[in-house]
């Protein structure tokens, strides 16, 4: 059965460059080892910001990236990326592949679209 | 340039086993999943099995699933494909397949092919 | 497993037709379509992947267009090379199944 991804539209980020979004996957298969990537898409280029591997111990993800980090729960996954710029504005995709047990399945979300907002920076004092 | 060459085909009786090779060069051979596809006399492409390119994942066709295993040596740049409990029915031509296991739109498909070996099932 | 059609089974074409070669999936597979030409006797070849890309060194008259169920790749321009059959693959979940291909021939 075909898997469905969805993740929100817009996501603003905050003040400090935080942007959190959660990327869920359904039907939920009953699967050991899910993958997920997170992609960024500017004009026709995709690149990859980063990806894990969870399974039902290693619910915590991405800890080889500084940027990024995730917590799994049955098919949802709670995404967090910190560290935006506003030059880091753009459409963030959530793609799941259900790896084990077989069949792989692959699934791509329709892509969230984050904006940033550098903050102004604090005016100088004069004492 | 890429070069896929498969070995060790041949004739074989129903219930024995057989080890096909795939010898690869002209590329870095861990950096890619790698797939075998089979083509019986006269007739179209049946997809076998596919390894990931660090080993981590195999998957099989319903066809082959406990009698096929799917194995690769990194060091000697081999892709394996171990046959056993064989039957009339996999007779055919077994085609090694490259795949770049680092697809992020496209999925994965096999970009270079081997030429082959025939691999025939008969008492 | 997702079952992969293709139609026709076999079309007689001149040299400078246009050929349209359909291929349908029996689920959703997204963009996760290859083709494949195969010549006799010869190994397959990579055509078009995910669904439209040309592969490298594929000339551009071949094309391929769909998503989701319904599948197609054009021959703008058929050459005397191109008489081959073709098969469509999806990548979408394992088994990657194949089309039972479609045989292009000389009218």
């Known amino acids: 059965e075909a898997i469905q991804v969805t993740q929100p539209s817009v996501v603003l980020a905050s003040s400090h460059g935080v942007a959190s979004f959660p990327c869920e996957y359904s039907p939920s298969h009953n699967t050991d080892e899910v993958r997920v990537t997170v992609l960024r898409q500017t004009n026709d280029q995709m690149t990859e910001v980063c990806a894990t591997t969870f399974t039902e111990k290693n619910t915590v993800g991405f800890l080889d990236y500084p940027f990024c980090s995730g917590t799994f729960n049955e098919s949802r996954v709670n995404l967090t990326i910190q560290g935006l710029r506003a030059v880091d504005t753009g459409l963030y995709l959530c793609k799941v592949e259900l790896m084990y047990p077989p069949p792989y399945f692959v699934g791509m979300g329709n892509g969230t679209q984050i904006y940033v907002i550098d903050p102004e920076p604090c005016p100088d004092s004069d004492f | 340039q890429v070069q896929l060459v498969e070995s060790g085909g041949g004739v074989v009786q129903p219930g024995r086993s057989l080890r096909l090779s795939c010898a690869a060069s002209?590329?870095?051979?861990?950096?890619?999943?790698m797939h075998w596809v089979r083509q019986a006399p006269g007739k179209g492409l049946e997809w076998v099995a596919v390894?990931?390119?660090?080993?981590?994942?195999?998957y099989y066709a319903d066809s082959v699933k406990g009698r096929f295993t799917i194995s690769r040596d990194d060091s000697k740049n081999t892709l394996y494909l171990q046959m056993s409990s064989l039957r009339a029915e996999d007779t055919a031509v077994y085609y090694c397949a490259r795949a770049p296991h680092y697809a992020i739109l496209t999925g994965y498909y096999e970009d270079y092919w081997g030429q082959g070996t025939l691999v025939t099932v008969s008492s | 497993d997702i079952q992969m059609t293709q139609s026709p089974s076999s079309l007689s074409a001149s040299v400078g037709d246009r050929v349209t070669i359909t291929c349908r999936a029996s689920q959703s597979i997204s963009s996760y379509l290859n083709w494949y030409q195969q010549k006799p006797g010869k190994a397959p070849k990579l055509l078009i992947y995910?669904?439209?890309s040309l592969q490298s060194g594929v000339p551009s008259r071949f094309s391929g267009s769909g998503s989701g169920t319904d599948f197609t790749l054009t021959i703008s321009s058929l050459q005397p090379e191109d008489f081959a059959t073709y098969y469509c693959q999806q990548s979408y979940s394992t088994p990657f199944t194949f089309g039972p291909g479609t045989k292009v021939d000389i009218k």
């Open positions: 995910a669904a439209s």
């Open positions: 002209g590329f870095t051979f861990s950096s890619y999943g």
């Open positions: 390894i990931w390119y660090d080993g981590s994942y195999k």
